[in-house]
Every structure is written in C-alpha cells, then in structure tokens.
Amino acid sequence: LRPSRVHNSEENTMRALTLKDILNGTFSYKTFFPNWISGQEYLHQSADNNIVLYNIETGQSYTILSNRTMKSVNASNYGLSPDRQFVYLESDYSKLWRYSYTATYYIYDLSNGEFVRGNELPRPIQYLCWSPVGSKLAYVYQNNIYLKQRPGDPPFQITFNGRENKIFNGIPDWVYEEEMLPTKYALWWSPNGKFLAYAEFNDKDIPVIAYSYYGDEQYPRTINIPYPKAGAKNPVVRIFIIDTTYPAYVGPQEVPVPAMIASSDYYFSWLTWVTDERVCLQWLKRVQNVSVLSICDFREDWQTWDCPKTQEHIEESRTGWAGGFFVSRPVFSYDAISYYKIFSDKDGYKHIHYIKDTVENAIQITSGKWEAINIFRVTQDSLFYSSNEFEEYPGRRNIYRISIGSYPPSKKCVTCHLRKERCQYYTASFSDYAKYYALVCYGPGIPISTLHDGRTDQEIKILEENKELENALKNIQLPKEEIKKLEVDEITLWYKMILPPQFDRSKKYPLLIQVYGGPCSQSVRSVFAVNWISYLASKEGMVIALVDGRGTAFQGDKLLYAVYRKLGVYEVEDQITAVRKFIEMGFIDEKRIAIWGWSYGGYVSSLALASGTGLFKCGIAVAPVSSWEYYASVYTERFMGLPTKDDNLEHYKNSTVMARAEYFRNVDYLLIHGTADDNVHFQNSAQIAKALVNAQVDFQAMWYSDQNHGLSGLSTNHLYTHMTHFLKQCFSLSD
C-alpha cells in the first residue's frame, strides 16, 4: 500500500534560484587565507572578531587581540608588527580607487595592553606598513612619506614635495595603481628593514579628467584626476632608496634608469628586494614590447646604488607586448643573483625559466602546450607553481612542486587528485620557508580551504569547507554547467555553458552570451559561482554561454597576441562564430539570442550587436569602452600602440562603437553607465548615446548617479533587476 501522492519527494522540495537570492548574497562562499607570521604560526580573525594566533605544530590557539579592543576604535583591519610588540588597528576606511583607500590608524601596545599615546599618527593616512623586522613604521600622509623608528617616536619626514594630484610619493597615481603595479602602495622595505625604496610619480603635465559628483549639495563637486588617455603625456617616475637607520645621513638616493629605457618615454613596473643591499627593478618602454630587469647593488663607499649593465636582462616580444597582462616578476633563489621567471618559450607558451647570467642562456624549467601561471615560492629544494597543464583544460589551476635540489628535477602535482570532482581551480598561500601552506580551492564544487604540511604535502586540517552553504544549496535547483571546446579554423574556442536544471536537448531555449573578452583575460574557468546568470538559467530557463576567443589568456601566444594592434575585431568575430556553432547544436531558439558584458565586455557586446549579422535580438553594455582614445594610456597602448598617424591611429578610429551607430537599428540595446566612473569614463557612453541619437536609432539607457565602474551598493540591485526585466521582455518571458 502506497500513498497516492508523494508530498516530500526531492523534486517537490527543490526550488529554483530567485533574483533575491543573488542580490542578498544568500549563496556566497568563504575562503580562508592564513595571515602567516612565521613558519608555523598564523593569525586569523574569528567569527566574533577576536584576532587569534594559531600554532600548527602544537595545535594551540591564542587570542592576541580581543574584539573589545577592536571595537573600541571601530577597527575593520589590523596588522601585527614583526616583533609582535604592537598592532596597528585600521578604522574609518574610505575607498578611493580600485585598491587605494585612506584610513585612521591606532597603535596598540601588546606589552601593556594600551594604545600608544603621544606622537599619534596624523589622519587620514594613505598607506601604512610595518618594517619586515622589528616595529619601524613607514606611512604616507598627504602624498609624503614618513618614518618612525618606534610607534611612539616622532616621525622623520622623508619627502617634502608631495602635492595632491601633482606629486605622489610612496603611493601610485591613478594609472599606475590601476594598470601597472597594480597596488595601493609604491614603497618597499628591504628584507631586514635597513632600506626603504619608494617611487615618486610626477603628474604635473598629465591632462585631467573632470566629472561631476552630485552628492546632495546645491552645487555638484568636480572630481579631478590626472588620467593619461591613449597618446597623452604620462607620469614621470623616479625610484629612491633611503637608509632607515640613519635617514638624515645622506637622504634618499635615486636608482638609475637603464640607458636603453631612459632614451624615450618609459614605465617602472615593479621592485623586488633580493637582499638588504641588492634590489631588482623592472622597467618598460612606453611601447610595451621591451622590458628591462635591472639588478642594483649598494655601494657602501659612495652610499649609492649601482646598476651595472652586466646585470640588465632584456625581455622582448616580437609578436605582441611584453609579458601577459603584466610583465612577470622574478623570484630569486638563495644565491641572491639567479632567479626564476615566467615568460614565453620558443613555442609561444608562458613557462618558468631559470636565469643565472643572461636571458639568452635561461634554462627552461617547465614546457608544453599549456602555461605556467604563477610561481608561489622557491625554497632551497622546491619550487611551487600553478599551471593549467592537467588534463589539458586551460580553465583549471593546479599547484605543482618541482624539486630543484636534485638532478634531474622531478615534478609532482600537489592538488590534481586531492578532491578531483570538487576542486580543479586552486591557489595557495605559503608560510615562511614553505613549512606549511594553505590551499584554497575555488571550484567547480563548493570552495574549500585546507592546511598542508610543506614537506610531505599531507593535509593537516580543513580551514573552511562552507558547510552552511552546502546545506543551503541542498534544496536549490542549480543549473548544470559544461566546459567544452569548439575547433574552428585552427582556433580552439573554449566555452562554458550554463543549462537550466531540467535541460532537454530536444527543446529550444533562449541564449544569453556573457562576454568579457579583454586581452589576457579568461572567462571559462572551473570555478564555483551562484550569480545572476545562475538565476537566469535556474528560474528563467535561459542557456548562458561564456566563450574565450582570440586575445584571451593561458593558451599560448598565438591566441593571446592575435588581437595585437587590432582590438575589437577578433574578439567579436569569435563570439559570433561560437553563437553559430551553438545554434547548430539544435537546442537554441535562434530568434531569442542576446549578449551582455561589462567594461571591455560592454565594448565587445556593443560591437557584436552592431556587427550586422542579425544573430542578436538584443543586448546590454554596462560601462563600456566606446573608443580606445578615451581609455588609459598604459592599458590601451600595450595592445594598440599609439593613436598617431605614423602608428595606429587608423585602427583607433575604425574600432569605435560610434562608427557603427547605424547598425544598432535592428537590435534592442540597453546602455548603462555610472556617472562617477573614474576608470571607463561616462564620456564613453555619452558618446555612444550621442551617435545613436544623431543616427536616429532608438535605444534604452540607464545611468547611475555618483556610481563608479563597479556600480555597487543599492545600484547593484537596481542594475540586475533592470537588466532582468530587459532580457525577459526581449525573450518574451512572463514576469
């Protein structure tokens, strides 16, 4: 005897994702990155906001800073001095650009349980950090650098020429922060804190972007940012080093720029300390296909820094730009002169090389038709790196160990078989001497963070396994995901397809293409996400596809550099090619195909809609670039050269969205932008809108007042609700 109706079958209790789930962040995950303070100790902020010290060897944990102390100054962040005497507490966080922010800092003395009084830090501070040894402090206030030997001491002022929007000391200007370093700081302590290196950026001749910030005053404020657009005057950079023990003795000493770099416009790209008296600087020509790595030594007799030509290593690309998105950084070995670095091999794949004397004599450490992505750590006997080698899926990341102490070197994949179904995309965080490390797995299953022994690779414990998320997802009908490839005209197009839960190949579904497509990007990755497109598949029954076409990363230089000097052509072609292939699969309703993207993706989606193919019914561009003449010099010129007649002006002009205004006539276009976008200026969308109006083409638009490139806060909810309505209307889906 069985009941005639089953009330609690799995199907009945399962529900689709809702837009509310996404906007509320109901299914967000946690990761656990230990804040390492020694070979076997790390700090972590507990759920109740205590700062806890963990000792892996003993299994013991200790609260070193109570939530009460944190709360007393409304601290949102902290930093322990290396001598463990003091903690800085950070509060009044105020965001500036992508990485930069200002804050108020309080110093707490752990030995007496009191805040340091006297010679308090000024506010707001732009950047602050401890020396690597002891408890010296370096900080940037009003674009100048200051040094304290101890937190309670009066400060020593290192620079005096700092001026808002003119001279930046120890912090980058807008373009260096976003496109070159990319960090909020531009100062670097030597390993034992003897020296402090810093960059000075002179923006006096850079044209200024100005936009209104409406706020709620009677008159809007004007935001002014020195922002070099393609072809404009760039910042002038200088690097100085000061002895922090006797800072007044000789003062800051400038590090010389290699002659072959200094002969024309150039960039500084990174600084790596090797020892307390050896430093490595990387420079780049403005035409970014030549990079120079320069190793400099301290001359005790002259108290200067010497950078002999014999210690200059040149990296040049003949088929594109130097490096991937950025020129890679060296990881020095224990001899303090040789180093490991990722750059293209003779077959055009980015691999680890060992450089002992010259780049020409570099020893290739990894090889194959895949790419090494990051070098995490080099110890006396091991090198840890990540790559996408395993099973030939470019969108995966596994961690490998190469034994460099033995010959021939042996390679071991540390992560490939750990949790094979759940985890195919890893990063790692190593303690001192790689005694222990944390693995953070981002998917494709629910993310998990684990702690491992650096010698044996044994898992010691789970740091975070997102149990609550796992339980919350038990009654959710998640979409299915597939990662596959299309082979088209000798090009491999990897794609990720997100399919509705009850997907049936014999039915027809609306298709949404989500595109980014920028140079050296990757969208098709084996990572976990429950986001807007998950909802569109789960609840609204759409198929969503992401395609990595020409110009994307980690599949070799042929694909990567295909877009060199020709942005806006192949990226768009490859999205269109993929759509045609998806239609051939038989389950796409070819009358209901849309495309959307943000930033570079907004540029590509706009060009795809205006391609005249008739493939797309509608599309959305959020904060798109519309002309490369409007975007930042460092980024744009890397891929496009200069907008001059004798260089690449013609393609700059040909690749604008405005030039295709007429072609938007037969598509539904939704254009969206924040008015306070410091990155891709509102100007871009204003020009698209003007061109469409002038061409008498109907379109929809939404601006977000005082919002930047991220459209965060309440704007996010409004944005995704608005885009959902637009797509449902386009696909004739009932509300």
């Epitope: 020694s38 000792n55 463990r84 003395d109 752990l110 030995s111 007496n112």
Partner: nanobody, 123 residues
C-alpha cells in the same frame, strides 16, 4: 642572562588546583616576557600562558578561564594558578623567558628555560 627555577608541581585529582612558581635570578627580571610551556609525553612543547613585561597576559584557548598567569617583579617570580585541572593537563611544565614581546608561541623564540616541574592529574 636569566636563570629560572620552577616549583609547585605534583599529583592532583581531576578538578583540583595547583599553583606553579618560577623564581628568576637577575636584576632585569621586570623587562622580560615570561611564559609557561608544557610538554606531555610524545607531544611537542606548547605555550600555555604568557605575560609581557607590561603585564599583558594571554592564554592558549585550551586553558582559558582555568589558568591564570601573574608576576611579582619585586620577588622576581612568575606564577601559574591552575584550576579545574583535567587529565589532559598532565605534562612537565616549564618556565621560559625572553626579551621583547610575549606573543611568541614557538619554543625556539624563548631562549631562557627552567628545568621543568611535573604535573600529574589523575582521573
């Protein structure tokens, strides 16, 4: 240089208490951070409690609320009051000293050690 000598260990029943003392030689005792470590058979030596020169204390989570560390600079002595003892607290308890911060949990960071005093907790 500082010499350390522990006392006060012994055999005690579960839930019982002991007060361990560590006498230090040297006139600069007040400038040292002092710590109590313990080592159970077959286990590594672990920091149980520490007190900075300024009097700030901290404890391993496993003993928090049960053990109290204190110092008497006039007597050059540091104390560990152990209450609500459990069989897993059985170990040799060592007194240790270091200049600078007390917030170090690795034995290698503590240069000065006593000989140790045995604490046995029976069930």
């Amino acid at each position: 240089q500082v010499q350390l000598q522990e006392s006060g260990g012994g055999l005690v029943e579960a839930e019982g208490s002991l007060r361990l003392s560590c006498a230090a030689s040297g006139r600069t005792f007040g400038s040292y951070a002092m710590g109590w470590f313990r080592q159970a058979p077959g286990k590594s030596r672990e920091l149980v409690a520490a007190i900075s020169s300024g009097g700030t204390t901290y404890y391993a989570d496993s003993v928090k609320g049960r053990f109290t560390i204190s110092r008497d600079n006039a007597r050059n002595t540091v104390y560990l009051q152990t209450n609500s003892l459990k069989p897993e607290d059985t170990a040799v308890y060592y007194c240790a000293a270091r200049t600078g911060s007390a917030y170090y949990t690795n034995r290698i960071d503590w240069p000065y050690w006593g000989q140790g005093t045995q604490v046995t907790v029976s069930s």
